[in-house]
């Protein structure tokens, strides 16, 4: 599975989404879990009602909520009041029995709020001759870049590593 | 209603391959995981692997990777199963399941009748 | 892989009878356990789903039951069409695995 890289701003929420063949995983329940290390477990956080037919009610488990939609194909978890503490590796899970499908791994990054004044010194603003019309960002503020850093996915607000 | 046919029986040389079908009908054969199951005479059951014909995503059981492949042809609703290098150890009656999903797990619903295959010189 | 047994491989009983078979994991299914019935002429039935649930149109004579490693179906009222083998299969971890099937014999 590629990683699909999702940014989020500290204090705000996020929503990341999880599309899979909703024929493909029919009757399953799906989960949300934090990858513990490279090789390590993914731990669960969330997993979608006990009944798959109740799957589009939003559960909650602490600020991680999760919702179904089954005929859509679309999963879609959502953290709240985001934290740098949140900032990982996680992956949506398609389940059966105790077996678990990776549908999609999802590289969480936290930007810091551009209104807190403390990190103003570190925030990067684009120059005059700078233009990201063509850019598809979920946020419009930017964090600072290192070097040779790519200000902005070119094409979607999700991007893929390999 | 729901109808798996598999093909009929084979006889076939030590180290010579096979590859026996199952036509399913009475549903979208598409969206329907297919299961394999072998059965050697006076023996249980071993699961092979399962197929989605959807995509052709299989998933085999670790005792059969490199044995067998799982293929699906969704124009003529038909799932195979090719065996590879065979031995007398692959003589066999084989199964070709549709699954359901059942309170979260999967389960074969529908089987069809079963292919004997014979390996012998 | 989670081995599956089945102690008992042929029980001979008699018409009429209530004959259990057991099903024994080596480790916890929760539940996720099916039972299938082979006929002489080989054709497969699934019977039970989920430990106790009944297959659409299985006669009501058939029960399941059991948790954790320990699971058994029930025949409440033996007849000459149950006939048969029985397999117990978990579908709880990948690779699926059955029992080694219980022969049902009529005195």
């Known amino acids: 599975h590629n990683t699909t890289v999702f940014q989020g701003v500290a204090g705000q929420s996020l929503q990341v989404s999880c599309p899979y063949d909703s024929m493909k995983h029919w009757g399953r329940r799906k989960a949300w879990c934090r990858q513990l290390g490279e090789k390590g477990p993914c731990q669960r956080v969330v997993s979608t009602h006990n009944l798959w037919l109740l799957s589009f009610l939003r559960r909650w488990n602490g600020s991680t909520a999760i919702t179904d939609d089954t005929l859509g194909g679309t999963l879609t978890i959502t953290l709240r009041n985001l934290q740098p503490h949140d900032a990982g590796l996680y992956q949506c899970q398609s389940l059966h029995g105790s077996e678990a499908d990776t549908l999609r791994k999802v590289l969480v990054e936290v930007l810091a709020d551009p209104l807190d004044h403390r990190d103003a010194g570190d925030l990067w603003f684009p120059g005059e001759s700078e233009s990201f019309e063509d850019a598809h960002v979920e946020h419009s503020i930017s964090r600072s870049l290192l070097e040779g850093e790519i200000p902005f996915p070119p094409t979607s607000h999700h991007h893929h590593h390999h | 209603q729901v109808q798996l046919q598999e093909s009929g029986p084979e006889l076939v040389k030590p180290g010579a391959s096979v590859k026996i079908s199952c036509k399913a009908s009475?549903?979208?054969?598409?969206?329907?995981?297919m299961n394999w199951v072998k059965q050697r005479p006076g023996k249980g059951l071993e699961w092979i692997g399962r197929i989605y014909p959807g995509d052709g995503d299989a998933d085999y059981n670790g005792k059969f990777k490199g044995k067998a492949t799982l293929t699906a042809d969704k124009s003529s609703n038909t799932a195979y199963m090719q065996l590879t290098s065979l031995t007398s150890e692959d003589s066999a009656v084989y199964f070709c399941a549709r699954l359901h999903i059942y309170d979260g797990y999967y389960v074969s619903v529908y089987w069809g009748q079963g292919t004997l295959v014979t390996v012998s010189a | 892989d989670i081995q599956m047994t089945q102690t008992t491989s042929c029980l001979s009983a008699s018409l009429g009878d209530r004959v259990t078979i057991s099903c024994r994991a080596s480790q916890d299914i929760n539940n996720y356990l099916s039972w299938y019935q082979q006929k002489p002429d080989g054709t497969v039935k699934l019977l039970i789903y989920?430990?106790?649930k009944l297959h659409s149109g299985v006669p009501s004579r058939f029960s399941g039951s059991g948790s954790g490693t320990d699971y058994s179906l029930t025949i409440g009222n033996l007849e000459q069409e149950d006939v048969a083998t029985y397999f117990c299969?978990?579908?709880?971890?990948?690779?699926?695995?059955f029992g080694g099937g219980t022969r049902l014999e009529i005195k």
């Open positions: 989920y430990t106790s």
């Open positions: 009475g549903y979208i054969f598409s969206y329907s995981w």
């Open positions: 299969q978990q579908g709880d971890t990948l690779p699926w695995t």
